[in-house]
């Protein structure tokens, strides 16, 4: 359905508030270093222009594509060359190359200061003084730090952010009301950003076939009562939505996401019995609710999977007629029967099944050949089951902090070339899998754990792509999306790594250590642990534990001292010398 003016079409569909919010997000995700005021100015100019097009779709420039309009606007920024360097060269290109160029310059790890949370009274005053600016600032700050954040979902976060301030700034104890809500939004926001980053990586690095396979598996688990044709329709629509958002087409993405929510709510009976409570909610909340909806119950009396996909003599005929449809149906049938499997495992099984059919359908006796597919599946299923069991036992034994430390050591030994901040960030997040998943019943552990690990490892891949330092990481990240986690799990100590020279400065600490929050103290200690392993990659667990225990004791002692700085200056070198001796 074509429109004379695309910008007018989207403005009318989305409404002014959402239109402005999405344009601000789009601009902030592209030009991550620009000041807030500059973005607000650009957004206001685009909005005023959109209004002229709504009034008269034939007005000058109203027929231009959104990429052309937005790109032209971004290229008016005066300091583009000074602030962004070679990104300014994008402006010499024509669409669609210009937009592709902007996309390639999105920075997953922008050099931006961490967001500092002001005092509650200061925030409440700012909220009351100018609510609109306060909320725009939130969108801007999140979007520029998370350039692939799912834009329509960010509008939902902003709505919750607004609601939290509206409620808590009137409460008797503002801080007690507000701070837990802000913590929750921050944690949920980081998780949402990381999940979306994996979707975009899947689409951009492995193509829409990979994303569609993921979506078939996940939606079949969620909607096991839905027919294959229904799941396929949802997958097609969902792929379009995420392709648009990952491609920077945020207005189209939000519009199509709203259409998808509308469709799902109008067709609940043929999708899932769990959608009812979502469909009564307002748009942003409804879309979020639908995305997070729990799995429906498995239908009674599902027929044998083996009958159609192994025992039937028509397997090769059906496969040859429409390979992707047949494999899609296999994945759908397998996934709807297995809510207890991770999506990544289901995709590995589908891949193994495909490889078996490719081999066997060319064999003398295809049926006898593909009957052996069962033997190939068992180790694929048991590997993540065993991994989850072992790591949950370790987590329960150690607790989160020490479990993170075990993973820090494990991953530093695997890929010691990776930067210390990246190893600390990724290992800390890998370690959070314990608290997130190990408390769940057995049937929910694997999907929780492995699919979460896929998200965290994607962060490692994305950061490593920006500054590649390890062939092993590149190999695990690029060879196969579904085998990333098993690839990293299989890595051993890097024997070729030349240990890092000892640098006393790395292990020099000061009194400021004592004023850090518990989390910041942990990060400091974990940074030292990574550096220790890089220096002595063959150090045993016992040796490392001894050093870390001494470190904790040394910090505790000096933080209790009257002259803390003097203590650090005196005890620090002793700790370093003792550590070197312990690791010799």
């Amino acid at each position: 359905d074509t429109h004379k003016s695309e910008v007018a079409h989207r403005f009318k569909d989305l409404g002014e508030e959402h239109f402005k919010g999405l344009v601000l997000v789009a601009f902030s995700q592209y030009l991550q270093q620009c000041p807030f005021e500059e973005h607000v100015k650009l957004v206001n100019e685009v909005t005023e222009f959109a209004k002229t097009c709504v009034a008269d779709e034939s007005a000058e420039n109203c027929d231009k594509s959104l990429h052309t309009l937005f790109g032209d606007k971004l290229c008016t920024v005066a300091t583009l060359r000074e602030t962004y360097g070679e990104m300014a060269d994008c402006c010499a290109k024509q669409e669609p190359e210009r937009n592709e160029c902007f996309l390639q310059h999105k920075d997953d790890n922008p050099n931006l200061p961490p967001l500092v949370r002001p005092e509650v009274d200061v925030m409440c005053t700012a909220f009351h003084d100018n609510e609109a600016t306060f909320l725009k600032k939130y969108l801007y700050e999140v979007a520029r730090r998370h350039p692939y954040f799912y834009a329509p979902e960010l509008l939902f976060f902003a709505a919750r952010y607004k609601a939290a301030f509206a409620e808590c700034c009137q409460a008797a104890d503002k801080a007690a009301c507000l701070l837990p809500k802000l913590d929750e939004l921050r944690d949920e926001g980081k998780a949402s950003s990381a999940k979306q980053r994996l979707k975009c990586a899947s689409l951009q690095k492995f193509g829409d076939r990979a994303f569609k396979a993921w979506a078939v598996a996940r939606l079949s688990q969620k909607f096991p009562k839905a027919e294959f044709a229904e799941v396929s329709k949802l997958v097609t629509d969902l792929t379009k939505v995420h392709t648009e958002c990952c491609h920077g087409d945020l207005l189209e993405c939000a519009d199509d996401r709203a259409d998808l929510a509308k469709y799902m709510c109008e067709n609940q009976d043929s999708i899932s019995s769990k959608l009812k409570e979502c469909c009564d909610k307002p748009l942003l909340e409804k879309s979020h609710c639908l995305a997070e909806v729990e799995n429906d119950e498995m239908p009674a009396d599902l027929p044998s999977l083996a009958a159609d996909y192994v025992e039937s003599k028509d397997v090769c005929k059906n496969y040859a007629e429409a390979k992707d449809v047949f494999l899609g149906m296999f994945l759908y049938e397998y996934a709807r029967r297995h809510p207890d499997y991770s999506v990544m495992l289901l995709l590995r099984l589908a891949k193994a099944y495909e490889a078996t059919l490719e081999k066997c359908c060319a064999a003398a006796d295809p049926h006898e050949c593909y009957a052996k597919v069962f033997d190939e599946f068992q180790p694929l299923v048991e590997e993540p089951q065993n991994l989850v069991k072992q790591n949950c036992e370790l987590f329960e034994q150690l607790g989160e902090y020490k479990f993170q430390n075990a993973l820090l050591v494990r991953y530093t030994k695997k890929v010691p070339q990776v930067s210390t901040p990246t190893l600390v960030e990724v290992s800390r997040n890998l370690g959070k899998v314990g608290a997130k998943c190990c408390k769940l019943p057995e049937a929910k552990r694997m999907p929780c754990a492995e699919d979460y690990l896929s998200v965290v490892l994607n962060r490692l891949c994305v950061l490593h792509e920006k500054t590649p330092v390890s062939e092993k990481v590149t190999k695990c990240c690029t060879e196969s999306l579904v085998n990333r986690r098993p690839c990293f799990s299989a890595l051993e100590l890097d024997e070729a790594y030349v240990p890092k020279a000892f640098n006393a400065e790395t292990f020099t600490f000061h009194a400021d250590m004592c004023t850090l929050s518990e989390k910041e103290k942990q990060v400091k200690k974990q940074t030292a642990l990574v550096e220790l392993v890089k220096h002595k990659p063959k150090a045993t667990k016992e040796q490392l534990k001894g050093v870390m225990d001494n470190f904790a004791a040394f910090v505790e002692k000096c933080c209790k001292a009257d002259d803390k700085e003097a203590c650090f200056a005196e005890e620090g070198p002793k700790f370093v010398a003792a550590s070197q001796a312990a690791l010799a």
Epitope: A300, S304, D340
Partner: nanobody, 124 residues
């Protein structure tokens, strides 16, 4: 990793009934399907019935349809086979089997874990 123990076999007259039970222990969370196979002297092991412990799907060999009923209890990780209208051709060692996936397969290779077997003899 998963142990299966069968019980309930024995000698029965043609036309009689017997109930076989099988209890799984160990890493039972990894089990999805449980089934029964049988092997008569000098013959290959053959599929009898299977059930998906987490749903209510069942599957039977044509030779036992209407006479045998399989039922599973996910909470207790047990499976039972109620055998009615027994005939001498049902004489065999009956094996309980467990699979890590929901295939409801007839092929023994789909099943990762096996019991020791229990003898069922139907006399005429």
């Amino acid at each position: 990793q998963v142990q299966l123990v069968e019980s309930g076999g024995g000698l029965v007259q043609a036309g009689g009934s017997l109930r076989l039970s099988c209890a799984a222990s160990g890493r039972t969370f990894s089990i999805y399907d449980m089934g029964w196979f049988r092997q008569a002297p000098g013959k290959e092991r053959e599929f009898v019935a299977a059930t998906n412990l987490r749903g209510v799907s069942t599957r039977y060999a044509d030779s036992v349809k209407g006479r045998f009923t399989i039922s599973g209890d996910n909470a207790k990780n047990t499976v039972s086979l109620q055998m009615n209208s027994l005939i001498p051709e049902d004489t065999a060692v009956y094996y309980c089997a467990a699979a890590v996936s929901n295939w409801l397969a007839k092929d023994p290779s789909a099943y990762s874990y096996w019991g020791q077997g229990t003898q069922v003899t139907v006399s005429s």
